[in-house]
Interface confidence: low
């Protein structure tokens, strides 16, 4: 008769964790003639057919069920046993849920911490930016995003086996030019005949693509670069100036900055 009451027995203490070495034995109650060999499903290089022992080195997270057979002239198969391998969360990633397109300053933004699987499934989430913990939910929400929120974000998913981090995800915030100011070189008081350079400084993403300069009468000047060079500077150039910066998001303007051009000693002497 074939071997009777064949069972596959896991020798390891439970739970089994990914990476463990797992030993299984193929047991039976009686056999006539004697058992001469064993078979395993799935097959593997770790079998020792004559001993009825299966050793799985570095068990994978997806190892599910194993079954053995004890054979004399016939083979009797045991019911499969589930290894029930436990493992840290897998395939963790940051996913932008909203908005669907690029992120503009003031948008409501939601980031989701996704993972493909975890065993056990009870997990905790952690969000961090530049090493600073931001939250412990599966989502990270910004009611009104600001340029200061831009940066590199990561999420972590923990279970009792371990923790897995996502790749860093870069959050880019687009915003209209802001913090505009007109700086003057060599200073805001220049002697006539010298040169004066006015620079429109700003903070914008994407960078400013177009500048417009205005004088104290709000007249636009025929200059569209970041720097406005007056050379030679004349007393008539004295007055307040401001600039406007434009990018694909919008426009921003600077406050007024006053340039004072004073007469040279020669001019004063002639008078």
């Amino acid at each position: 008769y074939p071997p009777k009451k064949v069972t596959t027995v896991i020798q390891n203490p439970m739970p089994i964790r990914e990476g463990d070495t797992v030993t299984l034995s193929c047991n039976y109650n009686s056999s006539n003639p004697s058992v001469t060999r064993y078979e395993w499903k799935p097959h593997g290089a770790w079998e020792e057919p004559s001993l009825g022992v299966l050793k799985i080195q570095n068990v994978g997270w997806d190892n599910t069920t194993i079954a053995c057979a004890a054979c004399n002239s016939w083979c009797s198969w045991a019911s499969p046993v589930a290894l029930n391998v436990q493992y840290a969360p897998r395939d963790v990633r940051v996913r932008k849920i909203k908005p669907l397109s690029e992120i503009h300053s003031g948008n409501s933004v939601s980031l989701q911490c996704d993972f493909s699987s975890s065993h056990p499934k009870e997990v905790q989430f952690f969000w961090e930016k530049n090493g600073r913990l931001l939250g412990k939910e599966s989502q990270l929400n910004f009611d009104s995003i600001s340029p200061e929120d831009a940066g590199s974000y990561s999420c972590w998913v923990n279970n009792s086996i371990g923790q897995t981090a996502s790749k860093a995800w870069t959050l880019e915030v687009l915003y209209a030019p802001r913090r505009l100011r007109v700086s003057m070189s060599p200073g805001d008081q220049v002697m006539e005949g010298k040169s004066a350079t006015l620079t429109c400084e700003s903070d914008a993403n994407p960078p400013v693509s177009h500048y417009t300069w205005f004088d104290w009468n709000n007249q636009s000047l025929p200059y569209h670069s970041q720097k406005l060079r007056l050379e030679p500077v004349k007393v008539q150039h004295s007055g307040a100036y401001w600039c406007q910066g434009t990018n694909s998001v919008g426009k921003g303007r600077s406050p007024l900055s006053t340039l004072t051009v004073y007469y040279s000693p020669e001019t004063i002497g002639r008078r």
């Epitope: 996913r95 849920i97 939601s110 989701q112 493909s116 699987s117 499934k121 939910e137 599966s138």
Partner: antibody, heavy 117, light 108 residues
């Protein structure tokens, strides 16, 4: 056997409501996101709505936003689509599918919703 | 919204030949692209996910490739059971998954 069993379709008047259930079996339901996909007669597939594993995140196609609500009851292994303010253009075969945030590997057999006066 | 455009609308192929189906996205996205097969009166069946990974039980004659905005499904040595409608789908832009309009593969 891994399967999604659907019920609850039927004929409804424009402006009416209908709730579609989808019962999951053979897999750990709360391991997976779920979605609804519809197919109008003779037309292609249109993703309608999705929900993540614990219901904390949902999404809708523009065509149904504000009218349809997706939900799930993990204790009952069930997914639902509440459809309000139905229109003639909502007439379609509605499939539930496993995969709210991934490819859809398991599909329900579909349930027909006809919106007609 | 990412728009998926499939071509051709209909492809006439003889059994044993190779069918090449194209799917173009309106904007680049990560590798979250799937292909489905649908036969008349049946729900769709997942063939390929992650651009090129075959789903369980899918024969090796089905292969996926591509990146960025251009993706391809190739069916080599076409069998009679492969005549069906095929859809591509992007599932990277949660929660705005979109399908292509479909390509019908018919017998020549």
């Amino acid at each position: 056997e891994v399967q999604l069993v659907q019920s609850g379709g039927g004929v409804v008047r424009p402006g009416g409501s209908l709730r579609l259930p989808c019962a999951a079996s053979g897999f750990t339901f709360d391991d997976y996101g779920m979605s609804w996909v519809r197919q109008a007669p003779g037309k292609g597939l249109e993703w309608v709505s999705g929900i993540n594993w614990n219901g904390g995140s949902t999404g809708y196609a523009d065509s149904v936003k504000g009218r349809f609500t997706i939900s799930r009851d993990n204790a009952k292994n069930s997914l639902y689509l509440q459809m309000n303010s139905l229109r003639a253009e909502d007439t379609a075969l509605y499939h539930c599918a496993r995969g709210g945030d991934d490819a859809f590997d398991i599909w329900g057999q579909g349930t027909m919703v006809t919106v007609s006066s | 919204r990412i728009v998926m455009t499939q071509s051709p609308g209909t492809l006439s192929v003889s059994p044993g030949e190779t069918a090449t189906l194209s799917c173009r996205a309106s904007q680049s996205f990560s590798n979250m692209l799937a292909w489905y097969q649908q036969k008349s009166g049946q729900p769709p069946r997942l063939l390929i996910y992650g651009v090129s990974t075959r789903a369980a039980g899918v024969p090796a004659r089905f292969s996926g490739s591509g990146s960025g905005t251009e993706f391809t499904l190739t069916i080599s040595n076409l069998q009679s059971e492969d005549f069906a409608v095929y859809y591509c789908q992007q599932y990277g832009d949660w929660p705005r998954y979109t399908f292509g309009q479909g390509t019908k593969v018919e017998r020549k």
